[in-house]
């Protein structure tokens, strides 16, 4: 989910503040301030619905909420793409759409959301506890993936309420540098602001909201579809293995769809940073698909319970893979 820090406004320095200190307090905070306020973590939402008329028919909708341009969407079932899931569809914003059974119809709904109708009879048909995953490749954020499934208790024709954080997978290769700089910048900015509090000038006007209190937005599908994002392609993986995600944590929301937004409430500085980040709500897990490890040919270390690091199987040209390949 996107987080926006409400940062206090800086007043102009009082007369007499000059030299290096003046430049530093003027220019740097403004640059960092801009970065901090505009920096938002992308979010992927997934909605799963079982059709009342056909018990083996599912409709999956996925969307990307971020500032980057989408280069590819991959939909799969049975787990995250590249981690044992079955690829169902690949959607590129300009090159086209490819889908494989049991996917029946994949389509772009908006520039940042896609839908996929699945139907099947026999071995390839989805079942109620199937986990569906949508992976969005975007620039400069990297790859973000969310997974979700209908809870076993769901009635046909209805869908579960939105769940907390499902799977979050990010290709750190593309975002590590930016994230690190932004994180450092924001911390440094806060440090500067704190120092200014104890100085007579410049004065700091208290803000209406706490500078460190991020504001969470709840994105409904209708809102998501309005995001003017360019999604290159989507892949959906599905399988009838036990569902990876526990969707039984109601958060309200549309009664018709199971809406599964990913909440990316942190910006990792590196693989080690994930070990100290809070683990999401029960029944969910966070994983990172790290292109850096993949390029180095190493498997990233396991960083702790509930936290798994997956190397990016696509290699150095990941951004043009099923994401951007014709």
């Amino acid at each position: 989910m996107r987080t926006e820090a409400q940062v206090p406004a800086l007043q102009p320095p009082e007369p007499g503040l000059e030299g290096a200190m003046g430049h530093r307090t003027l220019v740097l905070p403004w640059v960092l301030l801009t970065l901090c306020v505009t920096a938002g973590t992308p979010e992927v939402w997934v909605q799963v619905r079982m059709e009342a008329t056909e018990l083996s028919s599912f409709t999956i909708r996925c969307g990307f909420l971020g500032s980057g341009s989408i280069s590819l969407v991959t939909v799969s079932w049975g787990g995250p793409n590249g981690a044992g899931g079955t690829t169902l569809a690949v959607l590129h914003p300009e090159r086209g759409i490819r889908q494989w059974a049991p996917a029946r119809q994949a389509r772009w709904e908006t520039q940042s959301s896609i839908s996929l109708i699945l139907e099947g009879s026999g071995a390839s048909s989805p079942c109620a506890n199937t986990t569906f995953c949508c992976k969005f490749a975007s620039f400069p954020e990297g790859s973000w993936e969310a997974c979700g499934s209908l809870p076993p208790s769901s009635d046909p024709g209805l869908s579960a309420p939105p769940t907390p954080a499902p799977i979050l997978r990010a290709d750190l290769a593309g975002i590590l540098g930016v994230s690190g700089v932004l994180l450092f910048g924001c911390v440094y900015l806060l440090h500067l602001l704190r120092r200014h509090k104890h100085r007579p000038a410049p004065r700091l006007q208290p803000s209406r909201t706490s500078p460190q209190a991020p504001r969470a937005r709840a994105w409904a599908p209708s809102q998501a579809s309005q995001a003017a994002l360019h999604v290159p392609y989507a892949t959906i993986n599905t399988s009838c293995r036990p569902a990876t995600l526990d969707t039984a944590h109601p958060h309200g929301g549309p009664s018709w769809w199971a809406s599964l937004p990913t909440h990316a409430a942190h910006r990792p500085q590196g693989p080690a940073a994930w070990a100290s980040t809070p683990i999401p709500a029960r029944g969910s897990f966070v994983s990172v698909e790290n292109g850096l490890y993949a390029q180095a040919g190493e498997r990233p270390p396991h960083t702790g319970p509930g936290l798994t690091l997956f190397p990016d199987p696509r290699g150095p040209r990941a951004m043009e893979g099923p994401l951007g390949v014709r």
Epitope: S76, T110, Q111, S113, P322, R326
Partner: antibody, heavy 114, light 113 residues
């Protein structure tokens, strides 16, 4: 660099079957699907079907559904197309292409002759 | 199936001339969700596999000279070569990328006058 290697030629007798290969290198095989295209001498291009290494259910052009069988072997990064009950109508150049068609093999010339 | 019809079937041009060729589809190739047209253009020289020139009706593939321009929407599309070079002599195919089965046009053969 990305390469799709296909045997240059295959000569088979009518009624027999042939299994053409397309060995991929220079990219992550599991990240792209493989498309097969037929071109008869002096004619245009015909889409046969495509298969994704992450899905065992290929797509087929109805015209080729009973003629072609597409498979992949991820361990060797190779895609295969088996053509059965061959006739002279099957004599053509068969291409494999990666993903959206940004890379193509050089093609295998299939000659069906007794 | 979506039928792709190309015209003319052949073109004779002199080097340096501007040339345009047409491709019409039996159904719209416009994706209403993102307003993109899913049509590709390929160039095929004798004895070689096809080479992707244009995708999304108007986006040049990496490495393709800017003298090649794709345009059009819905069912009518055009490939323009602003100044034909000797190496451009080939057969040009349009391809439906909108839905299965993927279908190719009949081709336009570009010959030297």
């Amino acid at each position: 660099q990305v390469q799709l290697q296909q045997p240059g030629a295959e000569l088979v007798k009518p009624g027999a079957s042939v299994n053409m290969s397309c060995k991929a290198s220079g990219y992550t095989f599991s990240s792209y699907w493989i498309t097969w295209v037929k071109q008869r001498p002096g004619q245009g291009l015909e889409w046969i079907g495509d298969i994704h290494p992450g899905n065992t259910s290929p797509n087929y052009n109805e015209k080729f559904r009973t003629k072609a069988t597409l498979t992949v072997d991820t361990s060797s990064s190779t895609a295969y197309m088996q053509l059965s009950s061959l006739t002279s109508e099957d004599s053509a150049v068969y291409y494999c292409a990666r993903g959206w068609g940004d890379y193509w093999g050089q093609g295998t010339t299939l000659t069906v002759s007794s | 199936d979506i039928v792709m019809t190309q015209s003319p079937s052949s073109l004779s041009v002199a080097a340096g001339e501007k040339v345009t060729m047409s491709c019409k589809s039996s159904q719209s190739l416009l994706n209403s969700g993102n307003q993109k047209n899913y049509l590709a253009w390929y160039q095929q020289k004798p004895g070689q596999p096809p080479k992707l020139l244009i995708y999304g009706a108007s986006t040049r593939e990496s490495g393709v000279p800017d003298r090649f321009t794709g345009s059009g929407s819905g069912t009518d599309f055009t490939l323009t070569i602003s100044s034909v070079q000797a190496e451009d002599l080939a057969v040009y195919y349009c391809q439906n990328d909108h839905g299965y089965p993927l279908t190719f046009g009949t081709g336009t053969k570009l010959e030297l006058k």
